[in-house]
Interface confidence: medium
């Protein structure tokens, strides 16, 4: 059966910094997403090889990629608080796959001291419920994404 | 080639509440990011409510949050809008867009498939 290998389970790094968050499978897919999970899962990346990956506004600027879809590394640069949050890697095969989460804690540089990851994954509780939908890849552009802007913003 | 057809859309008087339907030919809605925007006289075109290809992101614009719902059925290759508690302020031509990305965006310059839009008039 399909699986995806997920590391590290769990990384502190400070205000500014960059994470990396890999994903692997054994091949077979049609793509892969990065999301957060929490009371609002949400999609931060779509990658296909051969097509340009879309990235949540949230994250438009900070995510680079290097690898492949079956063996996925993607760095997210200058980091914030509101970054903190379980990032689970889900691969689009004829069954989504789920990897085991990545706890990313991001704090203020004085206080890392306080908030350390154990040695232990993220609890398989942590993990969302597959989509309602299906998720079938497409050609992707650069764009995307939630956490937009309010509305009389927009064009 | 993408084409998107609405339709629900009319008259109904302040607090009621109607159902828009986006129908989806030539391709599967299944592949896309799709969003419902909306375009009063005189204003710019906004965006209501988004769905990622997924389904598992939603964005609504503060204005009609918690009360209307975007949904999907990739069975049906249609999308929805749901509208309850109708306002005056929410009479506007409503539109339904597809975007080549799986993820929302609520930037009407990110969808390159556009439906003919439906009347929505909110009055007594």
């Known amino acids: 059966a399909q699986e995806v290998q997920q590391s590290p389970h769990c990384t502190t790094v400070p205000v500014g910094a960059s994470v990396n968050i890999t994903c692997s499978t054994s091949g077979g897919l049609r793509g892969i997403y990065l999301r957060q999970l929490g009371p609002q899962p949400q999609d931060i990346i779509y990658y296909e090889d051969g097509v340009v990956p879309t990235t949540d506004r949230r994250f438009r600027g900070r995510i680079d990629f290097s690898g492949s879809q079956d063996n996925l590394t993607i760095t997210m640069h200058r980091l914030q608080l509101s970054d903190t949050g379980t990032y689970t890697c889900q691969a689009i095969t004829e069954v989504n796959v789920y990897g085991s989460g990545t706890l990313v804690l991001v704090t203020e540089e004085q206080s890392q001291g306080w908030h350390r990851c154990s040695d232990a994954p993220p609890r398989a509780s942590a993990l969302p419920a597959p989509p309602t939908g299906s998720a079938l890849p497409d050609p992707q552009t650069a764009s995307a994404l939630p956490d937009p802007p309010a509305a009389s913003a927009l064009p | 080639q993408v084409q998107l057809q609405e339709s629900g859309g009319g008259l109904v008087q302040p607090g009621g509440s109607l159902r828009l339907s986006c129908a989806a030919s030539g391709t599967t809605l299944d592949d896309y990011a799709v969003g419902w925007f909306r375009q009063a006289p005189g204003k710019e075109r906004e965006g209501v409510a988004c769905?990622?290809?997924?389904?598992?992101?939603?964005y609504y614009a503060d204005s009609v949050k918690g009360r209307f719902t975007i949904s999907r059925d990739n069975a049906k290759n249609t999308m929805y809008l749901q509208m309850n508690s109708l306002k005056p302020e929410d009479t506007a031509v409503y539109y339904c867009?597809?975007?080549?990305?799986?993820?929302?965006?609520?930037?009407?310059?990110?969808?390159?498939?556009w439906g003919q839009g439906t009347q929505v008039t909110v009055s007594s």
């Open positions: 769905i990622s290809a997924s389904e598992l992101s939603t």
């Open positions: 867009a597809a975007r080549v990305g799986r993820i929302v965006d609520v930037t009407s310059t990110q969808y390159q498939y």
